[in-house]
Each structure stands twice: as C-alpha cells, then as structure tokens.
Interface confidence: low
C-alpha cells in the first residue's frame, strides 16, 4: 500500500573538526521510495557537488572534508507523492583547534611609552589567550592587560618588561603557541654620576668623572665653556649598560665643563647634561673679595624673576661669566617644570637669585646672599615635599649633594635678615599678599612688603638640581 514518508531518524547537531568527515543521517520509511533532497542554510545541495557524498538513496549526506565555512543548518526533505513532503533539520558546528592568525612581532619601545604585542586568533570554541614571559605565565597588573583581541598591552613600559614573550591560544580542542618574540625596552640617556666642581691651584691636574646609563648605552662628550674640549685626555669604559668617562685636565684657567650623554632611539636622540666648575684657588677669595663685577642682567631664563634692570654679580672665575651663569640656570630650570604650582615660582626665584646674586657695586663689587628666612620659606613652606624628595635622591646618590652654583644654598649658612637687613637679599616673589596668600606679587623692589615669618632653622641640606633631559 502507498505510504507517506516518515523520517524515523531526525537530524541531530553534528560537531566536526576542520578537514574531518561529517555525516548527517536522514532515515525515511515510505512507499514508494521517496526522493530525498538536502539543503544548507535553505540552499539546495547539488548532487554533482564533489565536496559532498550522498548515499543510501539520499539518506546519508557526507561532507568529505569540512571547512570552517560549512557551519550552518542542514535539512533533508523526503517526498514520494503520497501525502506531503517531510523535513528534518540539524546543525553542523565546525570545531576548530586554535590558530594564531596574527602572531606577535619583535618590538622596540622607549621606557614609559605603551607597547602592544598583537595576537589575533581563530578557533571554535573561541580560544582564550594568555601570554608567557620567559618561562612563566604573565600575570596581568595595573600596567599589563590582555585585550579582548588577545593582544598584550603594556602601559608605561619599564626596563623589567624587556624579555621574550609568546602568546598561547587555548580551547577545548587544543593549544596553539606563537613563536617567541622579543620586547626590547630603550631608555633615555641619564646621568648617574655627574662631574664634581673643583677649586684647585694653578697648573694642577684635575679629573672630572661622569657616569651615564641608557639603552642603548649612551656616548659621552665633554664641553668646555660651550665649546668642544680642546685639551685634556678622555678615558672611557662600559660595563653593564653604564658608561664611565674621565676627563683629565691641566688647569691654567677656570672653566665650566659639561658632560653630555646621548643615545639614539630610531631617528631621535635623547640627551642628559650635567655641569661642573673648575675654579683656581687664588681666584676664589672669601665672600667680600669675590672676583667679579656688577652688570645689568641681560639673560633670558631669569628675566621674569629678577627685577627689571637688576644689577647682578657676574663671577669672573668663569671665562664668560654671563654665558656660564646663564647655562647653569638653564640646566636647572627644566627640573622645575615638574614641581607643584605652589613650589615652582618660589624655587625659580631662589634659583635665579642664587645664581645671579644681587650685586653691591662699591669699590669691590660684592654679591649679596639671599636672606636665610627666604631660603627656609622655600624649603619648608612652598617646596617642602619637593625638597624632601630631592634630599632623598641626594642620599641615594641620584643627585650630587654638592654642585657649586647649581645647588641652592644651605639655608642655615645664610645670613638672617634680623642680623643686618642690608647684608642679605630678599625674594619679593615669596612675600605674602594679605588678601590672597597664594599669589606672588609682581617684582617691583627688592624689599618685602610683609616679613616672612621667622621659620625654625633646620639642619643643613642642599637642594640639588638633576640634569635635564631633552629629545632632539
């Protein structure tokens, strides 16, 4: 008797790996024998398509080598003209072992910047991505994160981030490892040990010592009063990314010697500088006999800080006092860019008035030191936090503790304005404005409108300025 088709084995979901065989079975009972057709995502599968094999009168559909594009809904439809056509559907889920489609590459990056190591993956189920640094799994922290794409992002790259990395893509079917790549961290040139200032006798030998580090290891050049060093011998050694340069000089005249450490990052250079003075003993008389002269300040760095047409002391222990003293303030100035808005104007005033001291003309031109109270105001009121940080760095050897004109004076060694009001200079920038204590009045005269409170005297310390950094 004629019998309408009945599908006795409904289609089920089939999981298959790429390049494996996948088979759907659609068992049909009917009389006469039905015609069975197959569709994928509602598109008819053609009998002559060589990627498929259709057997058992159409009841078995075999995909001979599964591709990831074969994912979808497969349906069989049976019809023998008796009753209506019947249909059963099932899904093919193409499973795929993890595959790294965009592996990481070697990266060179400057310390402090952001590094991204790519690692794009494919796979089903979607692989999870982790990273290995050296031999250990990489643990994410506040600087390091694995992005949703699988890429590794490192914020504020540090030297210790350098090393060998590989990404690992993992799902239930397997694990894929990328090739090992190298993250190289380059570091701006930095001076570890700056040359120290010397006061020597005429005709003696002096060795200036400058140590710098960076990645790549920097080169060191020496400058004498703004020009390349013309005499003297230089000895250099490099060990553990630290370059050590010694300049030996035969002293016949005073000078300002600058050590410049430079290294290259791609097309750019980074530079660190530190200066030292070499003065000749007879030229360095006690304060009252200081060799020098009074002149109007004509520089640029301090023109907003010093009084208009200020008469400043220019020290002739330098071959070119104006240029040398200007270079000293210039070197220190950049360091002040990072201090707090409260500290900065006070520190700038102290720096400029210390390097370009007020000058008393008279028969012997005499520099007038800053009053102790103003120095203490900077140290303990305006710049307490910064001063403490600098002292800490000095103790740890990151700065020199004594660097002639570049150190702000030891407050305790300065004269007090209560001893002799004319023997020391005041810093008008630090005088309080009663209406708004945080404002600094414009520079009009070198006499304060209100006395700075007599702050307690403190142990001696020096406010050293570290070398400046620049990219050229």
């Amino acid at each position: 008797l004629p019998k309408a088709p009945v599908i006795t084995t409904p289609l089920e979901t089939v999981d298959a790996l790429v390049e494996e065989v996948a088979t759907f079975m659609c068992a049909v009972e009917s009389y006469p024998q039905p015609e069975i057709s197959w569709t994928r995502n509602k598109i008819l599968i053609k009998l002559f398509d060589t990627r498929y094999s259709i057997r058992e009168n159409g009841q078995l559909l075999t995909i001979l080598s599964v591709e990831d594009s074969d994912d979808g809904i497969y349906c069989c439809t049976a019809n023998n003209g008796v009753g209506g056509a019947v249909e059963s559907c099932g899904a093919l889920q193409v499973k795929m072992k993890p595959k790294i489609t965009r592996p990481p590459i070697n990266v060179k990056i400057i310390e402090g910047l952001k590094a991204v190591l790519p690692c794009t993956t494919m796979g089903n189920p979607k692989p999870s991505v982790s990273w290995i640094k050296g031999d250990s799994p990489l643990r994410e922290n506040s600087r390091t994160a694995v992005l949703e794409s699988g890429s590794l992002r490192i914020h504020n790259v540090q030297k210790e981030d350098a090393g060998q990395y590989r990404c690992v893509a993992k799902n239930s079917l397997g694990t894929a490892y990328s090739k090992v790549v190298k993250l190289e961290v380059e570091v701006f040139a930095r001076i570890l040990r700056a040359p120290e200032s010397h006061n020597v006798t005429f005709g003696s030998f002096v060795t200036l010592h400058c140590t710098a580090t960076g990645i790549p290891v920097p080169t060191i050049t020496w400058i004498e009063n703004g020009n390349a060093v013309s005499s003297g011998s230089i000895q250099e050694s490099v060990k553990d990314r630290v370059i050590d340069s010694r300049l030996q000089l035969f002293i016949t005249k005073p000078g300002l010697y600058t050590c410049i450490a430079t290294n290259k990052h791609g097309e750019k250079f980074s530079t660190a500088k530190a200066a030292a003075t070499v003065s000749i003993a007879e030229w360095s008389k006690p304060q009252k006999d200081n060799k020098g002269y009074c002149a109007q300040y004509r520089g640029e760095v301090c023109n907003a800080v010093l009084a208009k047409d200020a008469l400043v002391f220019l020290n002739t222990s330098y071959a070119d006092p104006e240029e040398a003293q200007e270079l000293l303030v210039h070197t220190a100035w950049n360091e002040l860019k990072v201090v707090s808005p409260l500290c900065r104007p006070a520190a700038e005033a102290l720096l400029c008035n210390h390097v370009f001291q007020e000058c008393s003309p008279g028969v012997v031109p005499t520099p007038i030191p800053i009053c102790r109270e103003y120095c203490l105001a900077v140290k303990e009121l305006f710049c307490a936090k910064e001063w403490l940080a600098m002292e800490e760095k000095t103790h740890r050897g990151l700065y020199r503790s004594e660097m002639h004109l570049l150190s702000v004076p030891e407050c305790s060694k300065l004269p007090s304005m209560h001893w002799d009001p004319t023997a020391c200079a005041r810093l008008p920038h630090l005088d309080y404005n009663k209406e708004n204590p945080k404002t600094f009045p414009p520079m009009t005269s070198s006499k304060p409108s209100v006395d700075i409170p007599n702050l307690p005297s403190s142990s001696s310390s020096s406010f050293s300025v570290s070398p400046t950094y620049s990219m050229t």
């Epitope: 250990s136 799994p137 643990r139 994410e140 922290n141 506040s142 994160a145 694995v146």
Partner: antibody
Framework: ELQLVESGGGLVQPGGSLRLSCAAS????????MSWVRQAPGKGLEWVSA????????YYKESVKGRFTISRDNAKKTLYLQMNSLKSEDTAVYYC??????????????WGQGTLVTVSS | QAVVTQEPSLSVSPGGTVTLTCGLS?????????PDWYQQTPGQAPRALIY???SRHSGVPSRFSGSISGNKAALTITGAQPEDEADYYC?????????????FGGGTKLTVL
C-alpha cells in the same frame, strides 16, 4: 567616583542559602577581574572566590568549593556570590573587591564596605 | 594548603622605621607569588598599599615600600606616622595549573607608640 556596594547579607540558618550582590560604578566593570573576600568577626582576611573580567573561569577557596558560586552580569555591572549549604564557620563580613586588571588574580585595588552574613540557628 | 605567616604584632615610634615580613610555612616567597600588601584600620574596609612585590598603588605615600628579602616578602614603613597604626595583611598568589589560590597572612597589628 569608583564604588562597590554589597547587599544580600543577613541571618540564615545552617544549611540555608543566601545570594550576595555587589553593584559596581565609576569604572569599566567588564574590564576587571573581581573577588569576594571575607573576614570573620575579630579575625583576618580570607579570600573566598575570584572571577576574571569575562566570567570565563571561576576560582574558589577549597572550603567553599561546591557550595558557593561566583558569577557576574557585565551588562548590569553586578557581581554575585550564591552561597548554599551555609555553615556557622561561614559567618563573616563579605567584601566585594575589584582586581587591578582583567585576570582573576590581580591585586585587590578597590573594596566595598562589606555585608555581614550570620549563620546561626 | 600553604600557610602565610606574619608577625602578630609590631610597634614603632613616630618617625621610626619598621619592617613587616610575610613568609610561607613551606618554602620561600618569590616574585612569582606576587606579594600584595593591604592596610586595614578598625571598622574600615581594607586598602591596597603595594602590589606585585614593590609597586605602590596610586595615592599611597612614598614611606611605604615593598621588597623580597631572603625568603620573605617585606613591607617597610620609613618615617612612620600615627595614622599608620592599623592591621597589615600580605597576600600571596599560589598558581598551579587550574588550581589557583590567593592566600592572606594572619595580619600584623602595627602600633605607632
């Protein structure tokens, strides 16, 4: 401002269940791992459970495995701790804490104020 | 399960320096344990101080520093302040395959005399 606010604590009998919630705000919740940490009265901190940013895996202290379930709903910016078969030794203030990165085990850089769970008959 | 050990209590004078340690009952603490340090004052939630051995969390004063010394993790407070009186907990990451753990020490009660 980053905030983590726990709720769902209370008194429950031994063998009972509670579900703690932690509502997060002020940061990209779905970019950070989260944890539950507890502190029994007068005692120290004890890590309980952790979950990474995407909820892809879960981790538990041995003594709560099989009884507690950590989960998260990134759309609702909420972390959960389902606690079943509670014992008297589970009595503690339960803190929800944010991890410093996406993983389950970054340092705990932000904490809620805690919710007290008391298991007693 | 590993036990993380800390001094039950320590005291320090204001302005003084004190070092709290964090050890393992079996074996040494290494950088692979990523030692983290937390501070808790009475009635408050804990606060993160140091993560991954020696990195300071933002807003944590520079007087707090972390290190690994010998076979222990250490938290050093240089120039202790009265407000530093609190309980301090270290936590170590123990990762072995899928069996990961984050174990707190018993805490050190620090008194600033």
């Amino acid at each position: 401002e980053l905030q983590l606010v726990e709720s769902g604590g209370g008194l429950v009998q031994p063998g009972g269940s509670l579900r703690l919630s932690c509502a997060a705000s002020g940061f990209t919740f779905d970019d950070y791992g989260m944890s539950w940490v507890r502190q029994a009265p007068g005692k120290g901190l004890e890590w309980v459970s952790a979950i990474p940013w995407n909820g892809g895996s879960t981790y538990y202290k041995e003594s709560v495995k099989g009884r507690f379930t950590i989960s998260r709903d990134n759309a609702k910016k909420t972390l959960y701790l389902q606690m079943n078969s509670l014992k008297s030794e589970d009595t503690a203030v339960y803190y929800c804490a944010k991890r410093s990165g996406r993983i389950a085990f970054g340092a705990l850089d932000a904490w809620g104020q805690g919710t007290l769970v008391t298991v007693s008959s | 399960q590993a036990v993380v050990t800390q001094e039950p209590s320590l005291s320090v004078s204001p302005g003084g320096t004190v070092t709290l340690t964090c050890g393992l009952s079996s074996g040494s603490v290494t950088s692979s344990n990523y030692p983290d340090w937390y501070q808790q004052t009475p009635g408050q939630a804990p606060r993160a101080l140091i993560y991954s051995t020696n990195s300071r969390h933002s807003g944590v004063p520079s007087r707090f520093s972390g290190s690994i010394s010998g076979n222990k993790a250490a938290l050093t407070i240089t120039g202790a302040q009265p407000e530093d009186e609190a309980d301090y907990y270290c936590a170590l990451y123990m990762g072995r395959g899928s069996n990961k753990d984050y174990v707190f020490g018993g805490g050190t009660k620090l008194t600033v005399l």
